[in-house]
Interface confidence: low
């Protein structure tokens, strides 16, 4: 596949994943769809670290947009080599995106491992922290969290989504990193156009 077409495809995929991460992180702030927990100390640290919003969202949005732009028609130079500037920019932004996706993966992984901050036997805390993630396989433990309601399946679903999305983002940013590097040195394979748009 041509580097330009590949870049555009990767870019659109990254932008979609960014939106998934941002929405998932936003939903983590409102367990079970209830806003009453958001302004209190009742949400886990991993939610407040905004892995999905900052890492998998904004930090990956940059390479996503850069890849889509790099897949467009040239503006810097002429003809099939015209996209080299955009490809170079995409190389750096893809590296930045990898860091963002790794941040999202780390935070989400920790969120899954530690479990949510919840009320159990009248005490707020990370009651699944010591299980080293084993609570994920024992659904009978999930109901022990008294508040926020259904916080365990809520967190598990959304953090799992963030883990999956950030893994895909790492792969796609890696692909774009290689693709853009090829694009810088070899240019695009597409025919010359009359207009440099």
């Amino acid at each position: 596949m041509c580097t330009g077409k590949c870049a555009r495809c990767v870019g659109l995929s990254l932008i979609t994943l960014c939106l998934v991460c941002i929405v998932a992180n936003a939903l983590l702030l409102v367990p079970n769809g209830e806003t009453s927990w958001t302004n209190t100390n009742h949400l886990s640290l991993q939610v407040w670290l905004m892995g999905g919003f900052i890492g998998g969202g904004l930090m990956v949005l940059c390479p996503g947009i850069a890849a889509v732009r790099a897949g467009g028609k040239g503006c810097c130079g002429a003809g099939c080599c015209g996209n080299r500037c955009r490809m170079l920019r995409s190389v750096f932004s893809s590296a930045f995106g990898v860091l963002g996706a790794i941040y999202c993966l780390s935070v989400s992984g920790a969120g899954l491992r530690n479990g949510p901050r919840c009320l159990m036997n009248g005490e707020w805390g990370y009651h699944f922290e010591d299980t080293a993630g084993a609570y994920l396989l024992n659904r009978t433990l999930w109901d022990r969290c008294e508040a926020p309601p259904r916080v365990v399946p809520w967190n598990v679903t959304l953090f799992s989504l963030l883990v999956a999305a950030s893994c895909l983002e790492i792969v796609l940013c890696g692909i774009q990193l290689v693709n853009a590097t090829i694009g810088v040195f070899c240019g695009d394979c597409r025919k010359k156009q009359d207009t440099p748009h």
Partner: antibody, heavy 114, light 112 residues
Framework: QVQLQQFGAELVRPGASVTLSCKAS????????MHWVKQTPVHGLEWIGA????????AYNQKFKGKAILTADKSSSTAYMELRSLTSEDSAVYYC???????WGQGTTVTVSS | DAVVTQTPLSLPVSLGDQASISCRSS???????????LHWYLQKPGQSPKLLIY???NRFSGVPDRFSGSGSGTDFTLKISRVEAEDLGVYYC?????????FGAGTKLELK
Amino acid sequence: QVQLQQFGAELVRPGASVTLSCKASGYTFTDYEMHWVKQTPVHGLEWIGAIDPETGGTAYNQKFKGKAILTADKSSSTAYMELRSLTSEDSAVYYCTRPYLGYWGQGTTVTVSS
Amino acid sequence: DAVVTQTPLSLPVSLGDQASISCRSSQSLVHSNGNTYLHWYLQKPGQSPKLLIYKVSNRFSGVPDRFSGSGSGTDFTLKISRVEAEDLGVYYCFQGSHIPLTFGAGTKLELK
């Protein structure tokens, strides 16, 4: 295992202040509220208040507002309770506790005497 | 405040007897999250209180099955099916549903 370590005894003069400490170990200090309870032969067990070590937020029993000040030091995983303007009524055993899950310190005996 | 009234204040028993302690609250102890935070503690002389029963009827780890808790709303009971020497001491009920948290006055379980 969870431990709440308190010092044994404090002898203080009437009108003075005293600060009791409670060093927590065996769990993440900032994850759980720390409560303080007073025990006397006359009034039994009385809840003084609680502090959230993460935020510093406190809740007090109205009876002890102005008498007790709760603070927490995250770096040393230690909760503190300052008792002010002490009188003989304040002579008691003071416990730091996580009462919902049954963790209690061994208690500090405060004796107010001239 | 949720005033917790414990009866009796003193309970003389013989070893092997059944013992029953009542705890009544001035208001319902059902928390807004649906749970009832009524716990039972045992305190022995010179020691800090030890948790026996949490949330009305759940035995704390290591607590023998001769201890059982029951009740709902405002009325609660702690039962000891066969009293043993190590069970002697002062029993307190504790409510954690409403601030300020409150304790009962205590029931002294002693030998006849």
